[in-house]
């Protein structure tokens, strides 16, 4: 027999099938050109010394074989003696080590058996009524197909499913969608209405995430504010990675869960942009402002559950001097300037009203003045910080005010508003005899003492009404009592107390007259 022809003789080996688990399988035969045909198969088991024979029986009952040696693929023409227009039955017999192994048979009409391609290119995946819908372009000249899918999860083996008949330029398949595990899908096609014809190869894997993206399960910490007025948000625990089926473990598109960090700066509400979303890998630096943070998980089906946090404001800035000068026209603040063309946000809020919204003002970009200071002024009419109470002031700075992560804290301090000089005057000044030449002076704390860092000191003034001599005694801001000594009996004195801030001398309290009685000896 010629090698290019099917040999109508008995094959050169005994005909018995050993029935072993190894051997030839998955035989498929199809037309590859107008007159050319191909059969191919898999061989399971050790291949050394194996000879393959493709067997063919015609409808007349006559049978022939092609000897292919160790090859598991054979091409032949319509002149090889095999009828291509009528139904034939084909199988493979593999001879090795004095035994024969036989593949399952396929019965088909070779001329009509076109090798179908699996879905190629982009397979679109979407969710439809709790199921998975896959859609793809029908390969050229292959309209009319039966389609099957197989799918597996990280913990299960392949399960086969049917997509049903397809008869259009686009084909689609409805498949089961898992709630909480990723899946790998593959698709294959064959010619519609030719049960004996062979299936195409399986398509490339289609990797599908679970319907619900996993909970982020992230842990954060925030560092303390640095000298530059910024603090780093750090990720202590990464989100748990999704377990993937075998074919999806490379850089498989479609299955990934993306995590995004959403920042909302609560302080300084008058700035241009309050919210920013960035990838979780990009851990930002933050100012000392208060923030709300969310980590949002999403996959190809949309957003999943999120995780939320609040980052309280960090008010522990380096001691930066804030000078406040109050004039007839209004009030001006001065502080050490940042770089050229910096925008500042000045925010203030009455102490004890932290729950309410703070008032804030955004300056135009400004350069440092000749003394290296930045300024902000307001008129008395504006009513800003006009009430006689303690205000918490925070100043933020940014050269790029529209970029939320580029703000920094310049300073955080307290200021007593309104007429602090008068409002801070100590009341209830009282004098008590202490000894023969000294008295104890007490007073109620100044309102300024409710404002951290505002009250610099008390000054107690004592005037001798006879000689008009005046002495002044500085007192720590935490004290509300002082002892005046070296006083003379029988002399009238007046005592007054004032409360001073770093930038403002307070108003004296009402004069309080006293004298030490002359002691008459017996």
């Amino acid at each position: 027999c010629r090698t290019s022809e099917c040999c109508f003789q008995d094959p050169p080996y005994s005909d018995a099938d050993s029935g072993s688990a190894s051997g030839p399988r998955d035989l498929s035969c199809y037309r590859i050109s107008s007159a050319g045909y191909e059969c191919s198969w898999q061989y399971e088991g050790p291949t050394a010394g194996v000879s393959h024979f493709l067997r063919c029986c015609l409808s007349s009952g006559r049978c022939c074989y092609f000897a292919t040696g160790s090859a598991t693929r054979l091409q032949f023409s319509d002149q090889a003696g095999v009828s291509v227009l009528h139904t034939v039955t084909l199988w493979v017999e593999s001879w090795a080590r004095n035994r024969t192994e036989k593949s399952p048979e396929v019965t088909l009409q070779l001329y009509k058996s076109v090798k179908y391609k699996p879905p190629l290119g982009d397979i679109k995946v979407s969710k439809l009524a709790g199921q998975l819908r896959m859609e793809w372009e029908t390969p050229d000249n292959q309209v009319g197909a039966e389609v099957q899918f197989r799918h597996r999860t990280p913990s299960s083996s392949w399960k086969l499913g049917d997509c049903g008949p397809q008869d259009d330029d686009t084909e689609s398949c409805l498949c089961p969608l898992e709630m909480n595990v990723a899946q790998e899908f593959q698709l294959r096609r064959r010619r519609l209405g030719s049960q004996g014809s062979s299936w195409s190869k399986w398509s490339s894997p289609v990797c599908v995430p679970p319907e619900n993206p996993p909970q982020p399960q992230v842990r954060f910490s925030v560092e303390q504010l640095g000298r530059d007025g910024r603090r780093r948000l750090t990720l202590k625990e990464q989100p748990t990675q999704l377990e993937l089926p075998e074919g999806c473990q490379g850089p498989a598109p479609g299955v990934e869960v993306t995590y995004q960090l959403q920042l909302h700066m609560l302080s300084c509400p008058c700035k241009a942009k309050a919210t920013r979303t960035l990838p979780l890998e990009k851990m930002p630096y933050l100012s000392g402002a208060a923030y709300n943070v969310a980590v949002i998980s999403s996959n190809r089906f949309g957003p999943g559950p999120n995780q939320t946090w609040h980052i309280p404001a960090d008010t522990h800035t380096e001691p930066v001097a804030l000078n406040i000068s109050v004039g007839t026209n209004g009030t001006t603040m001065y502080w050490p300037a940042r770089a050229q063309s910096t925008t500042y946000c000045i925010e203030w809020q009455p102490v004890g009203q932290e729950g309410s919204l703070a008032t804030c003002n955004l300056t135009a970009p400004q350069d440092p003045d000749p003394a290296g200071m930045a300024t902000y002024s307001w008129s008395r009419e504006s009513g800003a910080m006009g009430q006689e109470k303690c205000y918490h002031i925070t100043i933020f700075a940014s050269a790029h005010p529209k970029k939320l992560t580029l703000w920094s804290t310049v300073l955080s301090t307290y200021h007593f508003g309104g007429n602090a000089s008068a409002a801070g005057t100590p009341h209830h000044v009282s004098v008590k005899n202490h000894s023969l030449d000294s008295v104890s002076v007490d007073w109620a704390p100044s309102l300024l003492s409710t404002c951290p860092g505002v009250l610099k000191e008390y000054v107690v003034r004592c005037r001798d009404e006879d000689s008009n001599q005046v002495s002044e005694h500085p007192v720590q801001p935490t004290e509300t009592q002082v002892t005046l000594s070296d006083l003379r009996a029988g002399v009238a004195y007046t005592v007054q107390v004032r409360a001073d801030t770093a930038w403002l001398r307070g108003a004296w309290s009402q004069p309080q007259r006293f004298s030490i009685k002359v002691q008459v000896s017996d």
């Epitope: 399960q217 992230v218 954060f220 910490s221 946090w309």
Partner: nanobody, 124 residues
Framework: QVQLVESGGGLVQAGGSLRLSCAAS????????MGWFRQVSGKEREFVAG???????YFADSVKGRFTISRDNAKNMVYLQMNSLKPEDTAVYYC??????????????????WGKGTLVTVSS
């Protein structure tokens, strides 16, 4: 392993007050951010209040101005003072903890340790 035990729940009239306590053991308490969450049956657990190791606090909008949270690091205790209680404050209140610096989780999945809860019932 941190253990948390809540106490102080009970029945109270609308407008009344209640103070919940949470005793913590088994960890460096001052390093933990502590929080109170509440849950009505059939609904998700919701954030009520949180406090950092240095006593920065944060409250849900629904309780702002009515509830205060405080901690005593020496005694390993966290407190939730609830004033002007309303019927809609009725829930099981849970104490929760996470080892974190300066960040208060406001969703339950941000917390690592939980107490068993104490029931607060506000009658109208």
């Amino acid at each position: 392993q941190v253990q948390l035990v809540e106490s102080g729940g009970g029945l109270v009239q609308a407008g009344g007050s209640l103070r919940l306590s949470c005793a913590a053991s088994g960890g460096p308490f001052s390093g933990y951010v502590m929080g109170w969450f509440r849950q009505v049956s059939g609904k998700e657990r919701e954030f009520v209040a949180g406090i950092t190791g240095i006593s920065s606090t944060y409250f849900a909008d629904s309780v702002k101005g009515r509830f205060t949270i405080s901690r005593d690091n020496a005694k390993n205790m966290v407190y939730l003072q609830m004033n002007s209680l309303k019927p809609e404050d009725t829930a099981v209140y849970y104490c929760a903890a996470v080892n974190s610096f300066g960040v208060i989780p406001t969703s339950p999945n941000g917390m690592d340790y939980w107490g068993k809860g104490t029931l607060v019932t506000v009658s109208s």
